[in-house]
Interface confidence: low
C-alpha cells in the first residue's frame, strides 16, 4: 500500500492557486503524484504522475467551491486520494498593493495600485473581482509608535498639513468591507516633508 501525500494545502495569493503537499514521511521510494479537480461531477487530471509536490490550479473559476484531490503513486500501486475544498474568491490571500508616494511641501500624495491577478488579462486586478475593494492606509512619523489609519475613498489620497521637515512612513493593504477581509501590508515607504509654504498650482 502506498501512503498518501501529507500536509495537503492550497497556497493561493491573488488567485495564483498552487496545491502543495509533502511526500509521505516514511516513503522509501521515488513516488509520483497525480492531482485532479472536480468538474461537472467528473474528476479531471491537472498534474499527472509528476515528481513535483505542487500543482498549479490558477485556471480554476474564481467563484464557487472546488474539490481538489491528490494521491501518491508507485509503479501500479497508488495511495488513497486526499481531498480538499477550495473557494478562490473566499480563500485567496490578497497580496500587497503597489503604492506611489510623492512629497509636495507639507503633504504626501499617494496613489494605490491594486495587485494584478495571475493568468488574467494584463490589466486585470483584484479590484475587478471584488466590488467592495478599497484600501486601508496607515501612516506614522518615522521613529514613533503611534500609527494613524484611514480608508481612502479612491485610488489616491492626500495627507495634508503634516509637520514640515519630518519623515513619514506609509503602507497600504487591500480591504474588502463586505467580507471583512484584509490583505497583506505593502512594504513601508518613507518620505520627508519639506516646508509648509504654499505650493504654486
Amino acid at each position: 500500500m502506498v501512503p498518501p501525500p501529507e500536509n495537503v494545502r492550497m497556497n493561493s495569493v491573488n488567485f495564483k492557486n498552487i496545491l502543495q503537499w509533502e511526500s509521505p514521511a516514511f516513503a522509501k521510494r521515488n513516488l509520483t503524484f497525480t492531482a485532479q479537480y472536480l468538474s461537472y461531477r467528473i474528476f479531471q487530471d491537472k498534474c499527472t504522475s509528476t515528481t513535483l509536490t505542487e500543482c498549479d490550479f490558477s485556471s480554476l473559476s474564481k467563484y464557487g467551491d472546488h474539490t481538489l484531490r491528490v494521491r501518491a503513486e508507485f509503479a501500479d500501486e497508488h495511495s488513497d486520494w486526499v481531498n480538499i475544498t477550495f473557494c478562490p474568491v473566499d480563500d485567496t490571500i490578497i497580496g500587497p498593493p503597489g503604492m506611489q508616494v510623492e512629497v509636495l511641501a507639507d503633504s504626501l500624495h499617494m496613489r494605490f495600485l491594486a495587485p494584478k491577478i495571475e493568468n488574467e488579462y494584463e490589466t486585470w486586478t483584484m479590484k475587478n473581482v471584488y466590488n467592495s475593494w478599497t484600501y486601508n492606509v496607515q501612516y506614522w512619523k518615522n521613529g514613533t509608535d503611534e500609527k494613524f489609519q484611514i480608508t481612502p475613498q479612491y485610488d489616491f489620497e492626500v495627507l495634508r498639513n503634516l509637520e514640515p521637515w519630518t519623515t513619514y512612513c506609509v503602507q497600504v493593504q487591500g480591504f474588502l468591507p463586505d467580507r471583512n477581509k484584509t490583505g497583506e501590508w505593502s512594504e513601508p515607504v518613507c518620505e520627508k516633508t519639506t516646508s509648509d509654504e504654499t505650493v504654486p498650482s
Epitope: K147, Q149, I150, T151, P152, Y154, F156, L159, F175, T182
Partner: nanobody
C-alpha cells in the same frame, strides 16, 4: 496619550432615538479613524460604525444590523465623534465604547478605548 470620553447614553423606548458623543483629547491627527463599538451582556464586543476623515472627504463604515438606522459623524474642530441612533431596538442594548483606529469593525482591535456609555432599549 489619547483619551476618549463618551456621553449621551440612557434608557429609551423601542423605536426611539439617542445621540452619543465622544470627545477625544490628545488626539494628534484628523486622519485617524474613530468610531463606536458595543458590548451587550454575555456577548463579545463588536464594531458598530467607523469614520475616517481624509484629505478627500469622509468615509464611514457600518455593520449591517445598524446600517440605515445609525449615522456616524465627526467634528474635527471639536475633536468629537457622534453616533446618531434612530429606530432603536431592544437588540441595540449594550455598553457603547468610542475607539480610535477602528477600521476593521469585525474585530475590536482598536488602539484606544473610552470607558463606555450604557444604552438600554426597552420594549
Amino acid at each position: 496619550q489619547v483619551q476618549l470620553v463618551e456621553s449621551g447614553g440612557g434608557l429609551v423606548q423601542s423605536g426611539g432615538s439617542l445621540r452619543l458623543s465622544c470627545v477625544a483629547s490628545g488626539f494628534t491627527s484628523p486622519y485617524s479613524t474613530i468610531g463606536w463599538f458595543r458590548q451587550a451582556p454575555g456577548k463579545e464586543r463588536e464594531g458598530v460604525a467607523c469614520i475616517s476623515s481624509s484629505g478627500r472627504g469622509v468615509n464611514a463604515n457600518y455593520i449591517d444590523s445598524v446600517r440605515g438606522r445609525f449615522t456616524i459623524s465627526r467634528d474635527n474642530a471639536k475633536n468629537t465623534v457622534y453616533l446618531q441612533m434612530n429606530k432603536l431596538k431592544p437588540d441595540d442594548t449594550a455598553i457603547y465604547y468610542c475607539a480610535t483606529n477602528c477600521w476593521r469593525l469585525t474585530s475590536p482591535a482598536a488602539d484606544n478605548w473610552g470607558q463606555g456609555t450604557q444604552v438600554t432599549v426597552s420594549s
